[in-house]
Interface confidence: medium
């Protein structure tokens, strides 16, 4: 249905509050360096304009596309050239090229300092003084740090954030109430950001087909009672929603997401028995609840896969006349029967099945050729199972910090050219897989671990793409989305790497280290570990363990000393010399 005014249509559909929030998020994701006040002003002006168009659809400029209206607004920002350099050149272009240009300038690593919460009393005062501004600042700070954050989900988290303050600002001990709740929300927000970045990368780098395949597998696991037609319908709609959000079309994205939630709730009977509770909630909570809903039980009478995909004499006809539909059915049937498999594994199996049919359907006797195809899946299934088992055993032995360090060593040896901050960030996140997944029952471990690893490795790929330094990282990132993790797992030590020159400055520490929170202290130590490996890539695990032990003791000793700075400047060089000698 065509609307006279697109902006009025979205304003009416979303309501003023959500509309304003989404516009603020959109601008903050495009112009990440602009101060909050500027974005509030822009969002207010756009919302006022939308309101006027809703009242009179044939008003001046109301018929313009959202990209045109938003782009024109962004291009009025006076400091565009100073703050963003060549991004200002986007403003010379016409739509749709101008929007594509803005998207290309989104910075996945803007380098803003981590958000540090002020004192609880100050926070509560700000919250009570102007709730709308307080939540707007939250949207802005998250959006500018995460330019691909899933906007409707960010509105949901802002609502959660509001709930935390509404509750905790009434509490006797505000700090004790706020601390754990804000931290739990922070973890969820970071994971949500990484998951959406993975979805956007799937769409942008590998296309709709890859994203749809991923979604078919995931939703078939979650809704095994739904038939393929129903799964396909939801996947098609979901693809549109994520394409819009990844493309910066946040108003359309949020509106379509609400429509999808409405459709799912109206068709619960043919999707899942688990949707009822979600469907009684208001729109933001409803969509979030549906996205996180627990898996439905498997239907009890599922026939053998072999009947349809191996034993049937028409397999090649079915495949050749409608390849994607046939493979989609295979993926659906396999996924609904295997909720314990990771999505990545299911996609590898579908790929293997496709390759087998491509080969066999060209032979004189296809049925004999593909007769054992399902048995050939075994090594593909065994590989992630063994990987999870081995790594969870290591995690249980070393704990999270020790496991992160083991991964740090592993990944620095695989790709020593990658920047130290990136190696530290990614290895720390990879290490969290242990905490997140290893305590789960066997039936959930692989799915939890491998799909989480895919999301974290995507972060490595995104950061590496900005400044490519390692051909092997580029290769693993770009060749196949579903084989990224096995590709990284399979990388051996990079023997071509020329060790980095020793730089004493890298290993110089100061008393400020002592007052850092534990997590930041760990980052400092892990940074030193990576630098050490870049200097001495042939160091053995034993040697590294000794040096890191000495380093830990040195930090502990100096932080307990009367004259901390003096201790660091005197003992530091001795430690470095001892480390160099130990690593010869």
């Amino acid at each position: 249905e065509a609307y006279k005014s697109e902006i009025a249509h979205r304003y009416n559909d979303l309501g003023e509050e959500h509309f304003r929030g989404l516009v603020l998020v959109a601008f903050s994701q495009y112009l990440q360096q602009c101060p909050f006040e500027d974005h509030v002003k822009l969002a207010k002006e756009v919302t006022e304009f939308a309101k006027a168009c809703a009242a009179e659809e044939s008003g001046a400029n109301c018929d313009k596309s959202l990209h045109t209206l938003f782009g024109d607004k962004l291009c009025t920002v006076a400091s565009l050239r100073d703050k963003y350099g060549d991004m200002a050149d986007c403003c010379e272009k016409q739509e749709p090229d101008r929007n594509e240009c803005f998207l290309a300038h989104k910075d996945d690593n803007p380098g803003f300092p981590p958000l540090v919460a002020p004192e609880p009393d100050a926070l509560c005062a700000a919250f009570q003084d102007n709730e709308q501004l307080f939540l707007g600042k939250y949207l802005y700070e998250i959006a500018r740090r995460h330019p691909y954050f899933y906007a409707p989900e960010l509105l949901y988290y802002a609502q959660q954030y509001k709930g935390v303050f509404a509750e905790c600002c009434q509490a006797a001990d505000k700090a004790a109430c706020l601390g754990p709740k804000i931290e739990a929300l922070r973890e969820k927000v970071l994971l949500s950001s990484a998951k959406e970045r993975f979805k956007c990368a799937s769409l942008q780098k590998f296309g709709d087909r890859a994203f749809k395949a991923w979604s078919v597998a995931r939703l078939s696991q979650r809704f095994p009672k739904a038939d393929f037609a129903e799964i396909s319908k939801v996947v098609t709609d979901l693809t549109k929603v994520h394409k819009e959000c990844c493309h910066g079309d946040l108003l359309e994205c949020a509106d379509d997401r609400a429509d999808l939630a409405k459709y799912m709730c109206e068709n619960q009977d043919s999707i899942s028995t688990k949707l009822k509770e979600c469907c009684d909630k208001p729109v933001l909570e409803k969509s979030q609840c549906l996205a996180e809903v627990e898996r439905d039980e498997l239907p009890g009478d599922l026939p053998s896969l072999a009947a349809d995909f191996v034993e049937d004499k028409e397999v090649c006809k079915n495949y050749q006349e409608a390849k994607d539909v046939f493979l989609g059915t295979f993926l659906y049937e396999y996924a609904r029967r295997h909720p314990e498999y990771s999505v990545s594994l299911l996609l590898r199996l579908a790929k293997e099945y496709e390759a087998t049919l491509e080969k066999c359907c060209a032979t004189d006797d296809p049925p004999t050729c593909y007769a054992k195809v399902l048995d050939e899946f075994k090594p593909l299934v065994d590989e992630p199972q063994n990987l999870v088992k081995t790594n969870c055993e290591l995690f249980e032995k070393l704990g999270e910090y020790g496991f992160q360090n083991a991964l740090l060593v592993r990944y620095t040896k695989k790709a020593p050219q990658v920047s130290t901050p990136t190696l530290v960030e990614v290895s720390r996140k990879l290490g969290k897989v242990g905490t997140k997944c290893c305590k789960k029952p066997e039936s959930e471990r692989m799915s939890c671990a491998e799909d989480f690893l895919s999301v974290v490795l995507n972060r490595l790929c995104v950061l590496h793409e900005k400044t490519p330094v390692s051909e092997r990282v580029t290769k693993c990132c770009s060749e196949s989305l579903v084989n990224r993790r096995p590709c990284f797992s399979g990388l051996e030590v990079d023997e071509t790497y020329v060790p980095k020159e020793f730089n004493a400055e890298t290993f110089t520490f100061h008393a400020d280290l002592c007052t850092l929170p534990e997590a930041e202290k760990q980052v400092k130590k892990q940074t030193a570990l990576v630098e050490l490996l870049k200097h001495k890539p042939k160091a053995t695990d034993e040697q590294l363990k000794t040096v890191m032990g000495d380093f830990g003791a040195f930090v502990e000793k100096c932080c307990a000393a009367e004259n901390k700075e003096g201790c660091f400047s005197e003992e530091g060089p001795k430690l470095v010399a001892a480390a160099q000698a130990a690593l010869v």
């Epitope: 037609a229 129903e230 995909f309 049937d312 028409e314 046939f326 059915t329």
Partner: nanobody, 126 residues
């Protein structure tokens, strides 16, 4: 729940024609694999013709190829079987079956079709 209702059967002379219909409710007929089977007295249910959902891939048993045509009208949510050059050995009760969730016919095995109509009798005799 899917309901299927066949009609169009009857008595016809050898060489004659009939058109069977199968009206579906509870699921769109273009979203699911549908097929015609037949069962002669004292015999098992035998595949006659099928059509894939979403993609119009058609399938025929060797014994009916060139004589029977399967088709569907999505707007009426109805499946058809046009039967020409009928022979006495075509005498049977004709059933339509569907497999929701399967966009393609991937089987000629009756057991794999969970939903059936009640059947319509076709008698070919002079």
């Amino acid at each position: 729940e899917v309901q299927l209702l066949e009609s169009g059967g009857g008595l016809v002379q050898p060489g004659g024609s009939l058109r069977l219909s199968c009206a579906a409710s509870g699921r769109y007929i273009d979203e699911t694999a549908v097929a015609w089977f037949r069962q002669a007295p004292g015999k098992g249910r035998e595949f006659v013709a099928g059509i894939g959902g979403g993609v119009d891939i058609t399938y025929y048993a060797d014994s009916v190829k060139g004589r029977f045509t399967i088709s569907r009208d999505n707007s009426k949510n109805t499946l058809y079987l046009q039967m020409n050059s009928l022979r006495p050995e075509d005498t049977a009760v004709y059933y339509c079956g569907t497999r929701p969730g399967r966009p393609l016919i991937t089987s000629k095995v009756a057991d794999l079709y969970p939903y059936w109509g009640q059947g319509t009798l076709v008698t070919v005799s002079s």
